[in-house]
Amino acid sequence: IINGSDCDMHTQPWQAALLLRPNQLYCGAVLVHPQWLLTAAHCRKKVFRVRLGHYSLSPVYESGQQMFQGVKSIPHPGYSHPGHSNDLMLIKLNRRIRPTKDVRPINVSSHCPSAGTKCLVSGWGTTKSPQVHFPKVLQCLNISVLSQKRCEDAYPRQIDDTMFCAGDKAGRDSCQGDSGGPVVCNGSLQGLVSWGDYPCARPNRPGVYTNLCKFTKWIQETIQANS
């Protein structure tokens, strides 16, 4: 997250970190069910661990943390690497979470976002770009949903209805390491960090997010079919 600020503790209990060995963060994710995460489809990896209830990026033990293995990864059938359409994936955890103040699912919004809606994006991704500099703790950033026209103007021929753009002033954006993390609007999960320009936070080049309102049926049916 570029030019965000430290999230208040316990305010993002659905935020997950996807880790490679040894404790290498590569993506964020979101708890949407006691045993299921949502993340970006481009975050698919064979072997990874899931960390929930953790505030700092470092692997130091925190009393609220819960660690899991991903036992099943189900990318949306319409996703094709390295494209950006349909960029979502469900991950089944090896067991159900223990609900606490630090670990709790969030509901996926069935309503599509309208321009001007205020949202919060969070993650442990780099706070500088193109340099790489990781934060000590989870970062939060207020962003506003942009109209689909502004989105298409920013990225001609690259936007479809499985995506929406959101941004704030120039210099504020999600970035590498934030993929798959939550965009929360009005208390529900509206999007996932997906893609954007490189370096991040360029003027008139907003972040692009997976438009989850288009996928509520697929999410529900996939969880039911695999539970």
Epitope: Q24, G83, T126, G177, D178, Y198
Partner: antibody
Framework: EVQLVESGGGLVQPGGSLRLSCAAS????????MNWVRQAPGKGLEWVSY????????YYADSVKGRFTISRDNAKNSLYLQMNSLRAEDTAVYYC???????????????????WGQGTTVTVSS | DIQMTQSPSSVSASVGDRVTITCRAS??????LAWYQQKPGKAPKLLIY???SLQSGVPSRFSGSGSGTDFTLTISSLQPEDFATYYC?????????FGGGTKVEIK
Amino acid sequence: EVQLVESGGGLVQPGGSLRLSCAASGFTFSSYSMNWVRQAPGKGLEWVSYISSSSSTIYYADSVKGRFTISRDNAKNSLYLQMNSLRAEDTAVYYCARDLTSMQSRDYYYYGMDVWGQGTTVTVSS
Amino acid sequence: DIQMTQSPSSVSASVGDRVTITCRASQGISSWLAWYQQKPGKAPKLLIYAASSLQSGVPSRFSGSGSGTDFTLTISSLQPEDFATYYCQQVPIFPYTFGGGTKVEIK
């Protein structure tokens, strides 16, 4: 079959210009970032330039900055390298290479160059 | 710029030998290192990405390890087709930089 084929190399005098082309086939060219990498005779690999899938991000090695221009035409599945003010030290085999990393994607994960052309030879000599 | 230093610059080995090549980055690059194989007159071929992940179609006798600044490419049992030059490359930071190469020759 996934393939990259370079062309446009040749003999040119110092100070001259050349335009290299790289024709891509067998994959969705418009989805991938691309690179030019060169190799001087008997030497190692030297990265020259990078261009993102939509051409919004471009990088050059310091040794070619201000003299070389990378571009692409996604409609033609083609990558280009315009080389001006050529010097003897630019003599090399030039490869185009597909970058597996999408710098647009916001994961923190990097791959490498997974598909390379056969190379085209540029000789700068008087 | 990040400097990549490979060692040794050449190694003589026999079929069946275990060969180890090292690569050192001038600053930490996490796990973001790729290894390539190049045979004379041919283009480089990606062997390993993210320091230890084997590229599709590459034999399992090739393996990579390391993180931060120190990385290793190991060929567990050298085969005749493995005699070539090997390069490491750091990929997260522009300008991308390669190591100087290690030539694996027949003893």
